[in-house]
């Protein structure tokens, strides 16, 4: 269940996909990745107000309980719903190899 | 990849399973659920310090970028890794029915 996509906090403030440019140095990969040397990291950032992009019933429960017990129960959190694979060309003992990582770049976001 | 399970913030402070008791009124279910009248809601609560229970490479990247750009990139978030099913007995137009919900109670937690 993907509930409301309308953000009550104003445009761009709620859970959505953002792109952050990062160097291999930023990621701690400089010594083993040859290409790309710079990564466009897609990640899920933003607030999860009531029922916004609720991933499932657990997220809906969390919203209800957060409203009642905000000090105990946190609001739902903006996380990846799916991923885009990323291809890294990396150094190996014998030379170089092509490696795909399936859980590296967020493709779509929801609140949970 | 499930990284370190040792919490550097002290016992019970990091991402883990918590149980929160909630009534049907709390959950907004009073008008359609007959049983149970009270639910032991298991949810994931707690901090996600560096590499603690990192769900995947995306979580590891998020940790690295949060360290570099804390105002732009949030820390990973404590969310369910899996769920326990829950059976609800609910009112229907014709009487009552037994319904299983697979995405309601957190079973295990990780940081993402």
């Amino acid at each position: 269940a993907r509930n409301g996509d309308h953000c009550p906090l104003g445009p761009g403030r709620c859970c959505r996909l953002h792109t952050v440019r990062a160097s291999l140095e930023d990621l701690g990969w400089a010594d083993w990745v040859l290409s790309p040397r710079e990564v466009q990291v897609t990640m899920c950032i933003g607030a999860c107000p009531s029922q916004f992009r609720a991933a499932n019933m657990h997220a809906q429960i969390k919203t209800s309980l957060h409203r009642l017990k905000p000090d105990t129960v946190p609001a739902p959190c903006c996380v990846p719903a799916s991923y885009n694979p990323m291809v890294l060309i990396q150094k190996t003992d014998t030379g170089v190899s092509l490696q795909t990582y399936d859980d590296l770049l967020a493709k779509d976001c929801h609140c949970i | 990849a499930r990284n370190g399970d040792h919490c550097p913030l002290g016992p019970g402070r990091c991402c883990r399973l918590h149980t929160v008791r909630a009534s049907l009124e709390d959950l907004g279910w009073a008008d359609w659920v007959l049983s149970p009248r009270e639910v032991q809601v298991t949810m994931c609560i707690g901090a996600c310090p560096s590499q603690f229970r990192a769900a995947n490479m995306h979580a590891q990247i998020k940790t690295s970028l949060h360290r570099l750009k804390p105002d732009t990139v949030p820390a990973p978030c404590c969310v369910p890794a899996s769920y326990n099913p829950m059976v609800l007995i609910q009112k229907t137009d014709t009487g009552v029915s037994l319904q299983t919900y697979d995405d309601l109670l957190a079973k295990d937690c990780h940081c993402i």
Epitope: S35, P36, N84, M86, L88, I89, L98, D102 | -
Partner: antibody, heavy 118, light 107 residues
Framework: QVQLVQSGAEVKKPGASVKVSCKAS????????INWVRQAPGQGLEWMGW????????AYAQELQGRVTMTTDTSTSTAYMELRSLRSDDTAVYYC???????????WGQGTLVTVSS | EIVMTQSPATLSVSPGERATLSCRAS??????LAWYQQKPGQAPRLLIY???TRATGIPARFSGSGSGTEFTLTISSLQSEDFAVYYC?????????FGGGTKVEIK
Amino acid sequence: QVQLVQSGAEVKKPGASVKVSCKASGYTFDSYGINWVRQAPGQGLEWMGWISAYSGDTAYAQELQGRVTMTTDTSTSTAYMELRSLRSDDTAVYYCVRDTQYGGSPYWGQGTLVTVSS
Amino acid sequence: EIVMTQSPATLSVSPGERATLSCRASQSVSSNLAWYQQKPGQAPRLLIYGASTRATGIPARFSGSGSGTEFTLTISSLQSEDFAVYYCQQYNNWPITFGGGTKVEIK
């Protein structure tokens, strides 16, 4: 925007060598590798190899090993592919293709026709 | 090396009709598959990567599906500009390999 501009068509004799260039612009050259792909007339696409514009590390197709050399010049943002001991079946359009983090690439040079004929 | 086999070699379709192109890998390539369109005298153009993700600027009538060894490119309603040769490409392992192509021609 990303652009890859290749050198002009070449006609070579069997046994000779050819060196095709690929000048990149619109991005940081050493951030991505360059693949070389060729296409014989009326045929499909064949991957020849890859070079890191950052380190110069290479990976070549096995059947071309020993005949092909890929290099880069970061000062001019140019990649080169040299093929030696040319044969008639090396007649093809040669493309340079930039890496992307997603695998498939929208960034191809316009192609260089190399004709090997006696 | 991974062998990519495309079928049919030629597909005759009327404008406005649906076209379904197949690509089979000799071993699993997961979702590491791209589709390209090539017109005479031009470089290939990326349509789909990750088996199902449309590249920037590619119309919604192009869709990709499949994983492992069986993949499909579907063009929901052929436009005149879609008549071309289509190639699948695996990038799961080196050497990168391409299928032999499917020519989509006007019926």
